[in-house]
Amino acid sequence: KLLQVSTIAMQQQEKLIQQERALLNFTEWKRSCALQMKYCQAFMQNSLSSAHNSSPCPNNWIQNRESCYYVSEIWSIWHTSQENCLKEGSTLLQIESKEEMDFITGSLRKIKGSYDYWVGLSQDGHSGRWLWQDGSSPSPGLLPAERSQSANQVCGYVKSNSLLSSNCSTWKYFICEKYALRSSV
């Protein structure tokens, strides 16, 4: 009889341990769900606020057709300018046409006046060819007017209504470009 009671007690204890384990698992699962829910809500909130403020360009960016432009308020060397644009999900300005060049120079005149602004153009050290940062060649009308006498790497910049060249290690403002968001009407 005592043996029977002892066996039952052991079984009960085993059951209790299993239930505690299940409860622990459930608590862990619930905590994980709550955490996921929190992330999900934050993500939804983010998406909703971006959808609510769905202008084609971010604040402080200028729109022209399919592009958004950001004119920096700080100086940096060409390579740092490029990284500053990447931080914003953009690249240094790549001028595709005379119309775009006119828009940029016109906007700069209104905003800041006659300063130097890095664009995404650099000269290959070996061949001397000018290339945009994506590897494409500029159209003939959009080549820097003067060849820099620098022994260092040479990069392109915009000043007034001209495209010029300079040592990439000099400090200038810069212009970033990204695609404008299409409004989903």
Epitope: Y39, A42, F43, N46, L86, K87, E88, G89, S90, T91, Q133, D134, G135, E177, K178, Y179
Partner: nanobody
Framework: QVQLQESGGGLVQTGGSLRLSCAAS????????MGWYRQAPGKQRELVAA???????TYADSAKGRFTISLGNARNTVNLQMSSLKTEDTAVYYC??????????WGQGTQVTVSS
Amino acid sequence: QVQLQESGGGLVQTGGSLRLSCAASGSIFSINSMGWYRQAPGKQRELVAAITSQGRSTYADSAKGRFTISLGNARNTVNLQMSSLKTEDTAVYYCTIWARDRQQYWGQGTQVTVSS
């Protein structure tokens, strides 16, 4: 915590090709840009190529015409196809992301050795 896992490095002959891949995981919601830097022994880390979430790419002069950067289908992976490799491409290649939380995250690096 954000993790970046690089793969694809190795030893290759001059003129050969390699494809590097990098996958971002962890608590990351929004990526602004992804890219690859490299660091050769005794040199500074330099940007090789980068691509924005919109698919706009940028290359170092040394990479133009030889390397191609692309985003994976999941948009949290980035690939660097490297061809016509030269001995001067030997370096540790680091994957990086610029996230929307203003942070830049780095991978551990993968060794690329180009032998003549």
